[in-house]
């Protein structure tokens, strides 16, 4: 390589580049450095991609875009602080005497270093979006933030249409001018300004750098406003909802932020770039050097070519943008990826029946009247699987699916969850744990691994908690081994006897009905209805209670619903839940109230599934804004998202039991959403579909 073309984005930077080129040339540093003038970082990235330039220093956000969209790689990193190397930490600071946590930021007053700045804006906003705390409709991040906080100071937001809320806490200069300016004229600008906004009580939380509080407290050389401040009077907000002392930033932060880095095309030799810059920094990074690589004072600007706070440049070992940025920062960036110019005009929803088409049409009209974005379009399909195919092909955008279909959508079609359904706390028909219940009996104690030849009670053939999950789990764990995919026979041979009520049996193994008792007259044995006294979840528990079976597979609430006076029927009126136990997957037994730790699986709620290229935050942002208007079944806005009775049907578009659409948070894949135990059980059952 004879020459190296550096891309600049302003006249002062072009001038500094030319000076650096001369300095390098004068020192005999090879290859020679040329300066290519671009108009912006985006323009420079395009020039590098088109081989019209070779290198530029970018911040984390730009490294992300350049890497993701153009395949550029980081090769040389800046170091600002010898202690923490090529990174720093974005933190959220609160006053110690407040009770704010990361989970209670809604409605709180916020202080930011400046609009679009890494630590003060990109990381906290991206983090809040990515974790589902903050929903963004139609890529309008400014509006979303303005609505989320109870007033903010975001210097630089004055030129936006949301300045009222985003500049509400800003003060300007001593004479009250330049309010919300993205410059030192705004007293709450930059790291120290954002902290001052918190310290003076204007805001309740400040988004700053890990070192900001320590640099502005405890009597160090400080501006007058900070003299009396003590670092111990402030705390950090941690991602898990806890708080920590200011010195705990390594473990309690929003994200580790990567330093700026020099990026080049993937086919370029990163080592060559570092050798060139390293020779340069050895000669030109001292205060008495004829040219100073890490200073921009001579050009009346800041951070030209490199950040002025750079102490040295170091080679990057793993030269890909993801490794350099790190998971925390990547997650935050994901939340900010929304580009209003790329927002699709429509979100095409998959519908599967005439009533669903009607409800979807009404939803589209209702959303449109309220100017919700993107607009809904309804597209018919023949089956959930057909929806999945159409979404994979890019012809449809979204569909709500149940557990088994979520698995198929993810595994076979690569779809991902964008939002989920939340059911009422007390609604156990939709959200529950699957448990194996036994009588408390010290003389006849067995574990989950010792179920062979025991007597089993099930609510009915195909019931999720009573059949699909426990049997699937036993198959997947190798206890039940069906021959020729004959699950029924395999189960009948595994247990000594069972009661598994069934409708319209054919070739049904008798031992699966052996424990069933029928009605009071002994008729209707094993039928899949209440005529069989051991049918359903309460019936399966009764089968255990009356000593017909040794184990019952139930929902975690079943025992409570039928004990301690909750069920007045003669068979249940005297029962105490304390007389029953749960069998745990680890071989232990537990009290029945320990269901969260001792269960076979948690039944996953339904999820809205989309193509992996679809921006999930846009989908959730739309649904979240919509449910504020249409989520309550008794709302007066002309449409009920979570009710289908008007269409003489049920569970159209969403389950009627839904109380809210919720963000996926960290459950960004179908496996995360379903949970490992449910997946194990499902794979056990699916392995037997010959």
């Amino acid at each position: 390589v004879m020459e190296m073309q550096w891309c600049t984005i302003s006249d002062p930077e072009q001038q500094k580049c030319k000076d650096m080129s001369k300095a390098f040339q004068g020192a005999g540093i090879q290859p020679s450095l040329l300066c290519v003038q671009g108009t912006s970082t985006d323009h420079c990235v395009q020039l590098i991609k088109d081989q019209k330039a070779d290198a530029i220093t970018l911040d984390g956000g730009a490294i992300y875009q350049a890497g993701k969209e153009y395949g550029l790689k980081p090769v040389v990193g800046e170091v600002y602080d010898q202690d923490i190397g090529t990174s720093y930490y974005a933190v959220a600071v609160v006053r110690r005497n407040s009770n704010v946590t990361i989970n209670t930021l809604k409605g709180v007053k916020s202080c930011h270093t400046g609009i679009n700045r890494t630590v003060g804006w990109n990381v906290p906003v991206g983090y809040l979006v990515e974790t589902g705390h903050l929903s963004v409709m139609g890529c309008d991040v400014l509006k979303a933030v303005g609505d989320y906080f109870g007033g903010s100071c975001v210097p630089g937001a004055g030129e936006t249409s949301h300045s009222e809320s985003l500049c509400r806490l800003c003060r300007g200069d001593s004479s009250g001018h330049n309010v919300c300016d993205k410059s030192p004229l705004e007293r709450y600008y930059d790291y120290s300004g954002a902290f001052r906004c918190l310290a003076e009580g204007a805001g309740d939380v400040a988004f700053v750098k890990h070192s900001t509080v320590l640099e502005n407290t405890d009597g160090k050389t400080l501006p007058s406003w900070g003299k009396a401040l003590m670092s111990q009077d402030f705390q950090l907000l941690c991602r898990d909802g806890s708080r920590a002392d200011i010195t705990e930033w390594r473990r309690c932060h929003l994200a580790k932020v990567p330093a700026h880095a020099v990026v080049v095309r993937d086919d370029m030799d990163g080592g060559l770039i570092f050798r060139l810059l390293n020779e340069g920094q050895l000669l030109f990074s001292h205060e008495d050097s004829s040219f100073q690589m890490f200073s921009s004072k001579a050009y009346g600007q800041k951070n030209l070519l490199f950040k002025d706070s750079t102490l040295e440049l170091v080679p990057i070992a793993t030269q890909n943008y993801e490794s350099w940025l790190g998971q925390e920062y990547l997650h935050a960036m994901k939340g900010l990826l929304c580009d209003p110019n790329r927002l699709p005009h429509y979100l095409r929803w998959c519908v599967l029946s005439v009533p669903e088409i009607q409800k979807c049409g009404d939803m589209a009209v209702a959303f449109s009247r309220q100017s919700l974005k993107p607009e809904i379009q309804c597209v018919s399909a023949e089956s959930p699987e057909h929806c999945m195919q159409q979404i994979q092909a890019g012809h449809i955008d979204a569909v709500t699916l149940r557990g088994e279909d979520i698995y198929r959508a993810g595994k076979a079609y690569g779809l991902v969850p964008a939002a989920g359904e939340l059911y009422a706390e007390e609604d156990r028909s939709n959200s529950y744990f699957v448990v194996a219940v036994v009588r408390r009996d010290s003389s006849y104690s067995f574990t989950l691994d010792e179920l062979r030849s025991k007597r089993s009670c099930h609510p009915g053939l195909g019931s999720p908690a009573g059949w699909e999950v426990p049997i699937g789990s036993l198959i997947q764990r190798g206890f039940i081994r069906p021959k020729d995919c004959d699950v029924l026979t395999a189960v009948s041979e595994f247990f000594n006897a069972s009661c598994v009520p069934v409708n319209n049996p054919k070739n049904y193994p008798s031992s699966l009905c052996a424990l069933c008792v029928g009605d009071e007259k002994g008729r209707n044995k094993c039928v899949g209805s209440s005529q069989e006294r051991y049918y359903g979840y309460s019936g399966a528990f009764r089968c255990l209670v009356e000593n017909a079976g040794d184990v019952a597979f139930l929902k975690h609430t079943t025992v409570f619903e039928n004990t301690n006076g909750h069920n007045p029927e003669p068979w249940a009126s005297h029962l105490r839940w304390q007389d029953y136990e749960l069998l745990c997957p680890n071989g232990a037994r537990a009290e029945v109230d320990q269901f969260q730790a001792c269960n076979l699986a948690q039944m996953p709620s339904h999820a809205v599934m989309v193509h992996p290229d679809t921006n999930i935050f846009t989908v959730y942002g739309l649904l979240d804004k919509a449910q504020d208007l249409f989520g309550d079944d008794h709302n007066k806005n002309g449409f009920q998202m979570f009710d289908s009775s008007k269409y003489h049907s049920q569970d159209l578009l969403f389950k009627d039991a839904t109380v809210r659409a919720v963000p996926v948070r960290e459950k960004t894949t179908y496996l995360d959403w379903l949970g490992p135990d449910y997946v194990v059980a499902l794979e056990g059952m699916l392995s037997q579909q010959c």
Partner: antibody, heavy 118, light 107 residues
């Protein structure tokens, strides 16, 4: 009406093999298991095994697993039982029987008489 | 394998009489017991399953009872056409096994 029409009587020599057929009609052939049962004066009724016409999966009584082989031909709705290495003890009436709601014989064919004689 | 025992090889009765045929299993079969009758020159026909459930079309003079290991088929009023061999069978566990049969004779 469920009908199971079995093949006619067989007279075979010891050591030979025989194939008995059972043609089903009056229902969907692949919906129900087909069982085979041996009736002899010595041991009354003995269950030989069953076949699932849908996929050909079989289950045998251990004492017959080297004696009998069960197959089906879905296209003709016919089940077959091959009996090998015949001896006089195999002389009996052999029934095919269709399963019902539960997995055991409900409806029986008319039977096929097998005589094994030198 | 589960052994089903019908202790009476023959039972003699008159038309109009009530008769009970018994069957004992070598272990608890959880009421998974079927009864068949086989008339001379015919194939067996299912009468009862689950110890007491009558098969479609079976006259109500046939009733079954029992639990655990002991089972009974009762004909409340014997008819001439009931002359047959009666077999019990357990349908709890494969291999399905049959009793040796009880021959009902009309006096």
């Amino acid at each position: 009406e469920v009908q199971l029409q079995q093949s006619g009587p067989e007279l075979v020599k010891p050591g030979a093999s025989v194939k008995i057929s059972c043609k089903a009609s009056g229902y969907s052939f692949t919906d129900y298991y087909l069982h085979w049962v041996k009736q002899s004066h010595v041991k009354s009724l003995e269950w030989i095994g069953r076949i699932n016409p849908y996929n050909g999966a079989t289950s045998y009584n251990q004492i017959f697993k080297d004696k009998a082989s069960l197959t089906v031909d879905k296209s003709s709705s016919t089940a077959y039982m091959d009996l090998h290495s015949l001896t006089s003890e195999d002389s009996a009436v052999y029934y095919c029987a269709r399963g019902g709601d539960y997995d055991f014989p409900w409806y029986w064919g008319q039977g096929t008489t097998l005589t094994v004689s030198p | 394998d589960i052994v089903m025992t019908q202790s009476h090889k023959f039972m003699s009765t008159s038309v109009g009489d009530r008769v009970s045929i018994t069957c004992k299993a070598s272990q608890d079969v959880y009421a998974a017991v079927a009864w068949y009758h086989q008339k001379p020159g015919q194939s067996p026909k299912l009468l009862i399953y689950w110890a007491s459930t009558r098969h479609a079309g079976v006259p109500d003079r046939f009733t079954g009872s029992g639990s655990g290991t002991d089972y009974t088929l009762t004909i409340s009023s014997v008819q001439a056409e009931d002359l047959a061999l009666y077999y019990c069978q357990q349908h709890y566990r494969t291999p399905w096994t049959f009793g040796g049969g009880t021959k009902l004779e009309i006096k």
